[in-house]
């Protein structure tokens, strides 16, 4: 009867580091000739194991006792499997040659070895520089070294799945795979407390996906608004200017007071008021001795936030004379958003 070479398993999946058994049985012991295992087909196939003594095959052993004279089981075991071992293996029966070398007479159908390698923990990176609300920023998630190729990657922001992503799976050797995914997110002012999660699901993870996260707090910038107000002090020759720096993030802040464009004082604040949305407020007080000024003075609150171009708010203290010995102070709203303070100076 015709010789049959049977590889019962079409595929075998094994975790990297474990052992894989590749089964092969023959239906007859004749014609005499060796059994050999190959990885791959055709010209490019490589010999993996031969049931001819004298050859050394590290990591590969025969499963049955092939020295039994009635042995028909030519299964092999590959130990400490690596992703490089993935591929299709063929059990091949040869007939001893008369003059020429042994000739191949029958091959098994092949067993594909899938090496299950876990993906690395996802690495999520955001933009190199901070962005402002309204801007679109990209997050990238990378995971390496998994096998087989099938993998699922999801992006979540505050628990909601994101779309607008671009995902690529690559492999240098078709042995293990890498995934890279980029998602675009439009920043909003409320995003300081937000975070983005890259979730990777793979057969090796047994239903427990791996997560990588990035906090928006590392990539968002909310620029402050400035507001200058004043409170009169007694004696009436003093005015307290208050610059309220509101709703900014992150804390990196320097505040300068200028008088007629000349630097008068610099604050490098350390204490801030926290807002519920994650932004901060800062208030700077500046005491103006109005009696020292005989003419209008423009006071500027200049804020440098997070290495961005300075933003400013101006406030004019306007000087004018009265005949009475009392002083008066009033606020005159101005179309150019300056506050004009009129102050009557005492005559000595």
């Amino acid at each position: 009867k015709e010789l049959k070479v049977t590889q019962a398993d079409k595929s075998v999946s094994v975790a990297a580091g474990d052992s894989a058994t590749l089964n092969c049985t023959v239906s007859s012991l004749t014609p005499v000739g060796p059994i050999k295992w190959f990885k791959g087909e055709g010209q490019n196939r490589s010999p993996i194991y031969s049931f001819i003594g004298g050859e050394h095959f590290p990591r590969i052993t025969n499963v049955s006792d092939a020295t039994k004279r009635n042995n028909m089981d030519f299964s092999i075991c590959i130990s400490n499997v690596t992703p490089e071992d993935a591929g299709t293996y063929y059990c091949v029966k040869f007939q001893k040659g008369i003059v020429e070398p042994d000739t191949e007479i029958k091959s098994g159908g092949g067993t594909t070895l899938y090496v299950l390698a876990k993906p690395s923990s996802p690495e999520v990176s955001g933009p190199d520089s901070r962005g402002s609300p309204g801007q679109t920023v990209n997050f990238t998630c990378k995971s390496y070294g998994f096998s087989p190729r099938n993998i699922t990657l999801k992006w979540l922001k505050d628990g909601k799945e994101l779309s607008h992503l671009e995902t690529t799976i690559s492999s240098k050797s078709n042995v293990s795979y890498n995934i890279s995914s980029t998602v675009s997110v439009k920043l909003s002012p409320e995003d300081i407390h937000s975070r983005v999660i890259c979730e990777v699901a793979h057969v090796t993870l047994e239903g427990r996906p791996l997560n990588g996260t990035a906090n928006f707090s590392n990539i968002i910038r909310v620029s402050p608004t400035l507001k200058i107000t004043q409170q009169p002090l007694t004696p009436a020759s003093q005015v307290n200017l208050t610059c309220q720096v509101q709703k900014f993030y992150p804390k990196a802040l320097q505040l300068n007071w200028l008088e007629n464009g000349n630097l008068s004082r610099t604050d490098k604040p350390e204490h801030f008021t926290d807002n519920r949305d994650g932004t901060y407020n800062y208030t700077s007080l500046f005491l103006v001795n109005s009696s020292a000024h005989r003419e209008d003075v423009v006071f500027t609150c200049q804020v440098e936030h997070d290495s961005q171009p300075a933003i400013t708010e101006n406030h004019t203290v306007r000087a004018f004379a009265h005949s009475s010995s009392g002083g008066s102070m009033e606020t005159i709203p101005d179309n150019n958003a300056y506050y004009n303070w009129n102050h009557h100076h005492h005559h000595h």
């Epitope: 004749t30 014609p31 005499v32 001819i52 003594g53 020295t67 039994k68 004279r69 009635n70 001893k96």
Partner: antibody
Framework: EVQLVESGGGVVQPGGSLRLSCAAS????????MSWVRQAPGKGLEWVAG????????YYPASVKGRFTISRDNSKNTLYLQMNSLRAEDTAVYYC???????????WGQGTLVTVSS | SYELTQPPSVSVSPGQTARITCSGG??????YAWYQQKPGQAPVTLIY???KRPSNIPERFSGSSSGTTVTLTISGVQAEDEADYYC???????????FGGGTKLTVLG
């Protein structure tokens, strides 16, 4: 270097028993099938027993089947031949031999003489 | 009786080529080997698997097969090659190891 050293030969009466030993060294004994081959004085070689590497399977020609038993102890790297109901025609030099993958012989011991005589 | 057949003797002059044949086994179920035995010594394997030579055996010894007949060829015969040569086989169909009766090689001169 592969070495096979037989021992246990001697003179025994017909119907008697004898146990031969073969100490192996220089190779992985537990990976190789082994055999006993004998040679009667002035005659040719005759295979008398074979055993698989694990020791579970044994093989004999009709001439000795039921009288001879081959065994091995892989922990001691030793091959044995238990010979019972010995006959005059069993007189021979007994060699142990290592088998190749296809059950031919590549290494031989120096032999031990068994004489069956009354 | 021996299952494999080989000539009882072969004579050859030094430097000549000696050929010893062995037949009787089924090609599809047999592997063959050749063993050399000098008087008072244990056999030495010259050829196994029909034509494979162990690394310690000189190249002048070679094996070949043609159908059910195998041949041991000794080229450039030397005086020390005088010995008995046995053909041995493994019969896959019966799980046995038959031998030929042996061939005495005489180196003339």
């Amino acid at each position: 270097e592969v070495q096979l050293v037989e021992s246990g030969g001697g003179v025994v009466q017909p119907g008697g028993s004898l146990r031969l030993s073969c100490a192996a060294s220089g190779f992985t004994f537990s990976s190789n099938a082994m055999s006993w081959v004998r040679q009667a004085p002035g005659k040719g070689l005759e295979w008398v027993a074979g055993i698989s590497a694990g020791g579970s399977d044994t093989y004999y020609p009709a001439s000795v089947k039921g009288r001879f038993t081959i065994s091995r102890d892989n922990s001691k790297n030793t091959l044995y031949l238990q010979m019972n109901s010995l006959r005059a025609e069993d007189t021979a030099v007994y060699y142990c031999a290592r088998e190749t993958w296809n059950h031919l012989f590549d290494y031989w011991g120096q032999g031990t003489l068994v004489t069956v005589s009354s | 009786s021996y299952e494999l057949t080989q000539p009882p003797s072969v004579s050859v002059s030094p430097g000549q080529t000696a050929r010893i044949t062995c037949s009787g086994g089924s090609y599809s179920s047999y592997y063959y080997a050749w063993y050399q035995q000098k008087p008072g010594q244990a056999p030495v394997t010259l050829i196994y698997s029909d034509d494979k030579r162990p690394s310690n055996i000189p190249e002048r010894f070679s094996g070949s097969s043609s159908g059910t007949t195998v041949t041991l060829t000794i080229s450039g015969v030397q005086a020390e090659d005088e010995a008995d040569y046995y053909c041995g086989g493994y019969d896959q169909s019966s799980y046995t190891n038959p031998f030929g009766g042996g061939t005495k090689l005489t180196v003339l001169g």
